[in-house]
């Protein structure tokens, strides 16, 4: 289809190169359409367009993004060619930064339904480049903790070392919606709740002489409760002792409930007591089975290939640890009669 | 009298396949005792190449170099083989199987006298 | 993978002499380690398993010591069956099976 009519949107990503962070880009079509398609409203309710031109599925997935390659060739389908774009709804969702994400990206709806419609797309001409000098040694992070039940703040991380009042008018996204009442580079939230959990976009303009465009940046805020006050505590092996079958194999399993740490490096492991030997054993990665807002439950187990004799004299000892302290739990195998 | 024999060995050309079977006499595989192959090549030491847990014969192990190349499988339950691959001269070895302890542990109590498996054009 | 290293290579001692030979382990693997002796002509056979236990039917002249990476077989009172090479093994079965041999040490005796 013919480019040319899109209207066309530049936008700067300036990503750094200590974090990991995302980018994301709107199916941003012109306004009355985008009221209807997208459902990312700028309109009041009671301000309904005069006309509709593009009378486009409700659908928010019906949007269809390509990549237009530098050299002239026919535009890329985005799903088939980079797996590291991913499209959700009218978003488009870069999982990693780097120079190579530099181009245009061009979203029109995929039901074409009037003549008008033809003309119904944008094209977003995107530069991407790495956070040049640590010219703000403290700007925010791309992911940003709010505490439950306390006051807190998002700050806009290209924007960050910034005075309030230098700041341009900044608009703000919360997954994907616009948050209207929001233009400074900070979002002030005087009591955090779960629901402030979310995908955060800030926009501000930048202009020069040539043109101007528009610098974004991607926050993932998350709402986290206080850290732990408690040690982690075993939930499994409860017995300190289990019947076994000799050379038959056996697994063990060790389950702890670690408290909510912001920064977590939780600890098990398995190791092995023979009299007055110790040795930690080498088992399978530990996985985590359950994760709420207040803890999380990681199991790792031991697996004897066959259960000996020897087996039989030894201790097989859990070891859980936090930030905070240490829990170990024993079990002892002892052969199944009859 | 609790016995181990391994057969099947021979000249074999490089690039050939060959497998060995190793017969258990005075005594059935059960599932504590795990049967397993040793080569030692003319002149040097033994290197382990595969075991295989004796009852069901599901379980099986080997050593990082041999997989690929090489499969145990429990035949009978008097009989596992040793299917081996695109051979090369370094295979050239004595093949030896062996029986495990079984609830005792891991170590290697009763042998087979090998069986020689030559790899030349 | 572990790696098991044997020292010496090859020792000489006369008969009613001790021989100590040693066998190092690339990581800790507990008690978990075995000792052979191989004729020539012969399959192995084993002398000791989980470090320090006697096999069946093997003289007390042999004793075996040692955990964690660092394993010692001793012979004393020395004879002239003694005349073999001598392997060390780590066999380990917890999540995974792991079987590794030493390259050997040669006894002779005097």
């Known amino acids: 289809f013919n480019i040319s009519g899109c209207s066309t949107k530049k936008l700067l990503w300036t990503y750094s190169t200590r974090s990991e962070e995302e980018f994301v880009l709107f199916c941003d079509l012109p306004e009355p359409q985008k009221s209807h398609f997208c459902h990312r409203n700028r309109l009041s309710p009671k301000q309904v367009p005069e006309h509709l031109p593009f009378m486009g599925s409700n659908d928010l997935s019906d949007v269809q993004w390509y990549q237009q390659p530098s050299n002239g060739d026919p535009l890329e389908d985005i799903r088939k060619s980079y797996p590291h774009i991913i499209q959700d709804k009218c978003t488009l969702h870069f999982l990693t930064p780097g120079v190579n994400n530099s181009g245009s990206y061009i979203c029109r709806p995929k039901m074409i339904k009037s003549p008008y419609d033809v003309a119904c797309c944008v094209k977003m001409i995107l530069e991407v480049k790495p956070q040049t000098n640590a010219s703000c040694e403290y700007s925010a992070s791309h992911k940003q903790d709010l505490l439950l039940g306390s006051t807190g703040s998002i700050s806009c991380p290209s924007l960050s070392c910034q005075s309030d009042a230098q700041s341009p008018a900044v608009t703000w996204y919360k997954n994907g919606k616009l948050l209207s009442v929001e233009r400074s580079n900070r979002i002030v939230v005087d009591e955090v709740y779960d629901y402030h959990q979310g995908t955060y976009v800030c926009d501000y303009t930048q202009s020069d002489t040539v043109s101007s465009w528009t610098v974004r940046a991607v926050v993932q805020v998350r709402t986290i409760v206080g850290d732990t006050k408690l040690k982690p505590d075993i939930l499994d092996p409860v017995e300190d002792t289990l019947e076994v079958e000799l050379g038959k194999p056996l697994t063990i399993s060790c389950k702890a409930r670690f408290g909510f740490e912001r920064v977590f490096n939780p600890v098990i492991k398995w190791y092995i007591k023979d009299s007055d030997l110790e040795w930690e054993v080498s088992v399978p990665e530990a996985k985590s089975i359950k994760s709420t807002l207040k803890d999380e439950i990681i199991e790792r187990n031991i697996i004897l290939e066959k259960v000996t004799q020897r087996d039989l004299r030894r201790k097989f000892v859990c070891f859980v640890q936090n930030s905070i302290g240490n829990t170990t739990q024993s079990v002892q195998l002892k052969e199944k009669r009859g | 009298q609790e016995e181990l024999v391994e057969s099947g060995g021979g000249l074999v050309q490089p690039e050939g396949s060959l497998t060995l079977t190793c017969t258990a006499s005075g005594f059935s595989f059960s599932s504590s005792y795990w049967i397993c192959w040793v080569r030692q090549a003319p002149g040097k030491g033994l290197e382990w190449i595969a075991c295989i847990v004796g009852g069901g014969g599901v379980n099986t192990y080997y050593a990082n170099w041999a997989k690929g190349r090489f499969t145990i499988s429990k035949t009978s339950s008097t009989t596992v083989t040793l299917e081996m691959t695109s051979l090369t001269v370094a295979d050239t070895a004595t093949y030896f199987c062996?029986?495990?302890?079984?609830?005792?542990?891991?170590?290697?109590?009763?042998w087979g006298p090998g069986t020689l498996v030559t790899v030349s054009s | 993978d572990v790696v098991m290293t044997q020292t010496p290579a090859s020792v000489s001692e006369p008969v009613g002499g001790t021989v100590t030979i040693k066998c190092q382990a690339s990581q800790n693997i507990g008690n978990n380690l075995a000792w052979y002796q191989q004729k020539p002509g012969q399959p192995p056979k084993l002398l000791m398993y989980d470090a320090s236990d006697l096999a069946s039917r093997v003289p007390s002249r042999f004793s075996g010591s040692g955990s964690g990476t660092e394993f010692t077989l001793t012979i004393s009172d020395l004879e002239c069956a003694d005349a073999a090479t001598y392997y060390c093994q780590c066999t380990y079965g917890y999540s995974g099976y792991v079987s590794a041999f030493g390259g050997g040490t040669e006894v002779v005796v005097k």
């Open positions: 062996a029986r495990d302890l079984g609830a005792d542990g891991y170590a290697y109590h009763l």
